[in-house]
């Protein structure tokens, strides 16, 4: 059967019918429905929402909708023994305590089960000691402290401001520096945009607002007790001492009112420069300890959270493909929230819901996609991407053989300025072509394409006349699909103006104030940005599932491989003498990239010219495209990160949220001048160059003519 036979209507008409069916009003209604009570992973409320979504997806017309459950390690505060931080005097008396909860927003005062702010997976403990202010607790911040300022964090409690990097990296860095505890806080410089009021009068973070979040360093492992395998009934579970990625020191988050009380007394060294100073009326002294009159006072943490194995539920919906049912295009986003999830995740879940509804309508009219579409509502994303990872572990054999693409659908908005896309280079052309066909929702761009407004507002730093598309990092549910399994992946959302808004994430991220009203009043009253995101995500899924030839362009991988090879070579060339001494050469990598470029171009020519009516040939060419991403997977994984297996991209070792290119070589080169054994260190650089070279060359071979 040809694709058009299978679908009854012409492909162009199908896509238009699908997009036209998406309605802003429905997304608004779904968001409201999903945000009335908290849906914390592992709770009864979130199980009930899973069942509701299952039931509605069935009504919408999917072929099947199943709940899949796993028993994973989650973490909760102790209900009778709250977490807090105090300043204690020399007698041990608590003279100041941080707040035990966020003041609930108006209208939500009587809502039960609002989890108080906590750092998920923090161990229990009551460390006390002097405070050291460590800025963002990035790798470079600790270098500045330890190497330049000669400040020792050993035995100290460190206080770090949220922002710039994933909080788990902050905690890891503090642990490595010898800290006994970590206090995380939101500085107004990062979470309070000038000229905007605090919630409920605006979208800024009030002083009592706090960002929740997990502080794991899982490196793609999923459930800390069952790395590599699904956390099912018969799974072998590690003991807590052997669990993956758990922090070893107590950690707790606070708001800026409480942070003010801790930071205003700081003494010791002055901050090294203005980049260490936030917007609070405090000196931003580094410490250690408090100044003069307060020098006998200490800080004490009281952390009583517990980690427990808890059942979680994914919802998996299937729309069977008419022609290639054994080829899967996946649209997935999480359902669990820290509290109400007004933005994260429900602005994404509402969009997925509307996409499912629209696909269901087409199916009811007799249409089917060419390939199977799987829809997923993941659980426990906030606790370390657990639902998606466990499901992918359970279905890894199917996914690596049949997975065409994964489109992520967490928060649809983090601002209302322009589009933001991160994806594999294979999808660049798909995204560009799709956004040229969609209408921009932006003021001043009426009647213009989304591509045009996106290019204007977010131009590519390298390629003029094109919009920026970023590398995939992690911190969301695409991780297992892309970084572990090598399934082509992408994500899209509406974002802020990164030029003018220097705050990290959006101010109310993971706080109790992330409500439906936040979105409806301040971010997207008409839900037009949500609709645009639905069109982008849905349009990508539609094309991936329905186009006769997969909409992947391997030539674009050739372009970025060259760029990344140039970039890593330039990093290495900061050490010209050592490169000479240890005979480090990138010749082989450049040669492999050139071969890839040549073969990719020849493949593109064959792709254009082959007989598309020959089903065997068509399947053969599509398989080469599908398996190209898979070819970048090294089964041995990256050093010390076995579940990050993609040789071209991995989450940065210094910031899980960011993507790094040629990560094996990058990490081998990082801070190489400080390595004790330079010969061994440069040997590792050479080893990583050889792995990268082999992988690029091997990937190129998969695009060669098969016989």
């Amino acid at each position: 059967k040809s694709s058009s036979e299978a679908t009854n209507i012409t492909p162009k008409h199908n896509m238009k019918a699908f997009l036209d069916e998406l309605k802003a009003e429905n997304i608004k209604k779904f968001l409201h429905n999903f945000t009335q009570i908290p849906h914390l992973a592992g709770t009864e409320q979130n199980f009930q929402l899973a069942k509701q979504i299952q039931s509605q997806w069935k009504e919408f017309g999917l072929d099947s909708v199943e709940l899949t459950h796993y028993d994973v390690l989650l973490s909760y505060p102790n209900k009778t023994h709250p977490n807090y931080i105090s300043i204690i005097n020399e007698d041990g008396n608590e003279i100041f305590n941080t707040s035990l909860f966020e003041p609930p927003p108006a209208g939500y005062e009587n809502v039960s089960d609002i989890v108080p702010p906590f750092s998920a997976f923090s161990p229990q403990g009551m460390p006390e000691g002097d405070l050291v202010y460590v800025n963002y607790a990035r790798t470079e911040d600790f270098f500045k402290l330890e190497r330049d300022m000669k400040i020792n964090c050993s035995g100290k409690i460190v206080i770090a401001r949220y922002g710039k990097v994933f909080r788990g990296n902050k905690v890891k860095n503090a642990q490595l520096a010898g800290a006994t505890g970590v206090i995380l806080y939101s500085d107004p410089d990062d979470y309070f945009a000038p000229g905007v009021k605090s919630y409920p009068d605006g979208w800024n973070l009030p002083g009592g607002g706090v960002q929740r979040g997990n502080i794991l360093n899982l490196n793609g492992a999923g459930d800390p007790l069952t790395p590599g395998y699904p956390a099912n009934e018969y799974a072998y579970r590690r003991g807590m001492a052997e669990a993956v990625g758990l922090p070893s020191i107590p950690v707790h988050p606070i708001g800026y009112y409480d942070a003010q009380k801790l930071l205003e007394k700081m003494g010791g060294s002055a901050s090294p420069d203005s980049s260490w100073r936030g917007s609070l009326k405090v000196p931003y002294n580094v410490g250690p300890g408090f100044t003069g009159n307060f020098s006998t006072q200490k800080v004490k943490m009281h952390i009583h959270s517990t980690s427990e194995v808890t059942r979680i539920y994914n919802v998996i919906g299937t729309l069977r493909g008419a022609v290639e049912p054994d080829r899967y295009v996946i649209l997935g986003g999480h359902r669990d929230s820290w509290v109400f999830g007004g933005i994260d995740p429900q602005s994404g879940a509402a969009v997925v819901h509307e996409i499912v509804r629209s696909f269901g309508m087409l199916k009811k009219e007799g249409w089917r996609p060419r390939r199977t579409i799987l829809f997923a509502s993941w659980d426990a994303e906030e606790f370390g991407l657990l639902g998606s990872t466990e499901w992918a572990e359970e279905n890894s054999r199917l996914l690596q053989e049949r997975g065409v693409a994964y489109i992520n659908a967490d928060s649809s908005i983090e601002g209302n300025y322009t589009l933001r896309v991160d994806c594999t280079p294979l999808m660049y052309s798909l995204v560009y072509n799709l956004t040229k066909e969609l209408e921009s929702p932006d003021e001043g761009f009426e009647g213009k394409s989304l591509y045009e407004s996106w290019t204007k507002k977010s131009p590519s730093p390298e390629f003029s006349g094109m919009p920026r598309i970023s590398k995939l990092g992690s911190g969301n549910d695409f991780e297992v699909f892309f970084q572990r399994l090598g399934i082509a992946s992408g994500r899209a959302r509406y974002t802020k103006n990164w030029e003018t808004n220097k705050f990290s994430s959006y101010p109310l991220y993971h706080s109790v104030y992330e409500t439906y009203e936040l979105v409806e009043k301040f971010y997207d009253p008409m839900f037009k940005y949500h609709l645009t995101v639905a069109q982008v995500r849905g349009g990508m899924v539609f094309e991936l599932a329905n186009s006769v030839v997969l909409p992947f362009d391997c030539r674009d991988y050739a372009v970025v491989l060259r760029k990344y090879a140039d970039k890593i070579y330039n990093i290495s060339m900061k050490h010209p003498q050592e490169m000479k001494t240890y005979s480090v050469s990138f010749d082989s990598l450049f040669s492999a990239v050139k071969n890839f470029t040549e073969i990719a171009s020849k493949f593109s020519e064959r792709l254009r010219d082959f007989d598309k009516s020959n089903p065997i040939l068509l399947r053969m060419m599509n398989d080469q495209l599908m398996f190209l991403e898979r070819a970048f997977i090294d089964p041995l994984g990256l050093p010390d990160r076995p579940f990050y297996r993609h040789v071209i991209y991995a989450p940065s070792s210094h910031n899980k949220y960011a993507g790094e290119s040629f990560p094996g070589i990058y990490d081998a080169l990082f801070d190489i001048e400080s390595k004790v054994d330079p010969s061994q260190a440069w040997g590792e650089v050479k080893r990583q160059i050889s792995i990268a070279t082999f992988t690029v060359q091997a990937a190129a071979e998969t695009l060669s003519e098969v016989a």
Partner: antibody, heavy 121, light 111 residues
Amino acid sequence: EVQLVESGGGLVQPGGSLRLSCAASGFTFSSYAMSWVRQAPGKGLEWVSAISGGIGSTYYADSVKGRFTISRDNSKNTLWLQMNSLRAEDTAVYYCAKDGVGATPYYFDYWGQGTLVTVSS
Amino acid sequence: QSVLTQPPSVSAAPGQKVTISCSGSSSNIGNNYVSWYQQLPGTAPKLLIYDNNKRPSGIPDRFSGSKSGTSATLGITGLQTGDEADYYCGTWDSSLSAYVFGTGTKVTVLG
């Protein structure tokens, strides 16, 4: 047989604009990086700009960055160079060149005959 | 000015051999492929050597290329009057993300 034919050159005043075209035939245009290379009278070759195969990522020499824009239409097998804010030092024969490898510039295996651009008041 | 340096001119009698050097740095010649172009008077350049030492079909084996470190060399043996032309080396520069040409060398056939 591969053919590249440039057009659009001519006399233009300083500060003016000109758009050069290059019509390509005899190969799969979309799969190959294309470049513009210029040669001032009595001088050597100077690479000006390139555009990749695939989505068409662009590269520019520092001397033309912000003033020149390279683009392509794969459906029409055509390459363009939009030249704005022209200066006397932009006077040259402009050649269109095809890459010999693929989507990014490695070497130029086919060249057009060139089109002369004269910037003078 | 060009980042690749060539001698302005070389000359030899018919039948003799000439070599043209092209000197660059690690970010261009050192880690990228070198190509050579011949430009006969009044014509467009023509590819002579690619990938350091390969000849396109139709280019006689009198022309050869080599690369060592951050320098490349074009050799022409059995020099003929038809070889009188300007010769340019070229390569990608990884630091500039740009293609670079050499300064050019004029080959004169004596006598």
